[in-house]
C-alpha cells in the first residue's frame, strides 16, 4: 500500500537533511532507490526518488501533479507523481509536463497560436466544480485577494515586481500574476531559449537572486536539449 | 519571509498527550495545505500529517492514524497537532512545513519550508 511505502524504512532513515529549517526551503536529500514510480502509462523505476505527500499540484514541483499512485485512487495519501508527457492522458492541466496542457483529456503542446483561447475556456469550465480547479492557489487568490493584510507578501495578486515585497517578484500563475519568491542558489529556474517563450508558461518563476544567473546544471550537459535542467548557479 | 515557529513540546510519558502549536507569518497562511513532519534522532524527515488549505481533508501516516489529529486556525495563522496515547517511537522533533511547490521540478520533504522544530520525548 502507498502508506506501507511511506512508512518503509528505505523512506525513513535518510541521511539528516542538509537545510530547510528556519523558514527557508532546505537542499534535496535523495534516498530509496528503485521505488516505483507512476510516470506516463507505465510504472517505472526512479533512482533516488522519496515519494512526497501533498494534498495539491501546487505543493509538487513544475515536473510533477499531486494524485494518488494507486490506479483506482486511495482515498488516503497521495504523492507528488512525475508529469504526463505530450500525448499521455490527462485529467487537468497539472498532470502534463511543462510545455504542454490537457486537451480532450491527452496532453498537448502549448501552441502559442491556440493556448491561450482554450487554456480560458478550460479555466472558466471549471472554474465552479472544486474538483477540477487547475490550481487551488491562484484561483483562491483571484477571488480574495482582500484576504492580504500586507501588500505585495508571497501570493498577493500584483502586475508588475515593484508591487511584490523585497525577495519577491511578481510572475504568471496560471491566468493571474502573484509575488513569488526570488529563486535562490541551487533551485531549477527557467532559461528561455527565445524571447517572448515565456508567454507559454502557467507557472512562471521568477528569476535567480543577486549574484546568480541561469546556467546549465553541470551533470544535465549530456542530457538532450530538452530535457536540460537549468539551475541559479553563482557567477 | 517565510516564519514558523513551532511550540509544545516537551516530555511526557508513553500514553500520554501534547498539543503542538506553529504559528505561520510572512505568507498568505490560508492558502496553501501545510504539514508536519518529524525527526528521530539519527534519522531522517518523516512525513506525519497533512491538512489542506479550509481544513477539509487531513492525511495522516500509518504509524500515527487514530493518535495524532491535525487541525488549523486561518484566522489565527496557526496550525495544530494534537498527539494522544503517544509511544517512545513518537519521540522526535516535530517540524510544522509547508511546500516550496514551484520552485524546484521535483518536491522532497527537504525543500520544504519549515521551522527551528519543538522536541518531543516519551520516556518512562
Known amino acids: 500500500t502507498l502508506n506501507s511505502v511511506l512508512n518503509s524504512n528505505a523512506i525513513k532513515n535518510l541521511p539528516p537533511p542538509l537545510g530547510g529549517a528556519a523558514g527557508h526551503p532546505g537542499s534535496a536529500v535523495s534516498a530509496a532507490p528503485g521505488i516505483l514510480y507512476p510516470g506516463g502509462n507505465k510504472y517505472q523505476t526512479i533512482d533516488n526518488y522519496q515519494p512526497y505527500p501533498c494534498a495539491e499540484d501546487e505543493e509538487c514541483g513544475t515536473d510533477e501533479y499531486c494524485a494518488s499512485p494507486t490506479r483506482g485512487g486511495d482515498a488516503g495519501v497521495q504523492i507528488c507523481l512525475a508529469c504526463r508527457k505530450r500525448r499521455k492522458r490527462c485529467m487537468r492541466h497539472a498532470m502534463c509536463c511543462p510545455g504542454n496542457y490537457c486537451k480532450n483529456g491527452i496532453c498537448v503542446s502549448s501552441d502559442q497560436n491556440h493556448f491561450r483561447g482554450e487554456i480560458e475556456e478550460t479555466i472558466t469550465e471549471s472554474f465552479g466544480n472544486d474538483h477540477s480547479t487547475l490550481d487551488g492557489y491562484s484561483r483562491r487568490t483571484t477571488l480574495s485577494s482582500k484576504m492580504y493584510h500586507t501588500k505585495g507578501q508571497e501570493g498577493s495578486v500584483c502586475l508588475r515586481s515593484s508591487d511584490c515585497a523585497s525577495g519577491l517578484c511578481c510572475a504568471r500563475h496560471f491566468w493571474s500574476k502573484i509575488c513569488k519568491p526570488v529563486l535562490k542558489e541551487g533551485q531549477v529556474c527557467t532559461k528561455h531559449r527565445r524571447k517572448g517563450s515565456h508567454g507559454l508558461e502557467i507557472f512562471q518563476r521568477c528569476y535567480c537572486g543577486e549574484g546568480l544567473s541561469c546556467r546549465i546544471q553541470k551533470d544535465h550537459h549530456q542530457a538532450s536539449n530538452s530535457s536540460r535542467l537549468h539551475t541559479c548557479q553563482r557567477h | 519571509e517565510v516564519q514558523l515557529v513551532e511550540s509544545g513540546g516537551g516530555l511526557v510519558q508513553p500514553g500520554g498527550s501534547l498539543r503542538l502549536s506553529c504559528a505561520a507569518s510572512g505568507f498568505p497562511f490560508s492558502i496553501y495545505p501545510m504539514k508536519w513532519v518529524r525527526q528521530a534522532p539519527g534519522k531522517g524527515l518523516e512525513w506525519v500529517s497533512h491538512i489542506t488549505r479550509d481544513g477539509g481533508r487531513t492525511m495522516y501516516a500509518d504509524s500515527v492514524k487514530g493518535r495524532f489529529t491535525i487541525s488549523r486556525d486561518n484566522a489565527m495563522n496557526m496550525l495544530y497537532l494534537q498527539m494522544n496515547s503517544l509511544k517512545p517511537e513518537d519521540t522526535a522533533v516535530y517540524f510544522c512545513?509547508?511546500?516550496?511547490?514551484?520552485?524546484?521540478?521535483?518536491?522532497?520533504?527537504?525543500?520544504?519550508?519549515r521551522g527551528q522544530g519543538t522536541q518531543v520525548t516519551v520516556s518512562s
Open positions: 512545513a509547508r511546500s516550496a511547490g514551484k520552485v524546484v521540478s521535483r518536491a522532497s520533504l527537504e525543500n520544504d519550508y
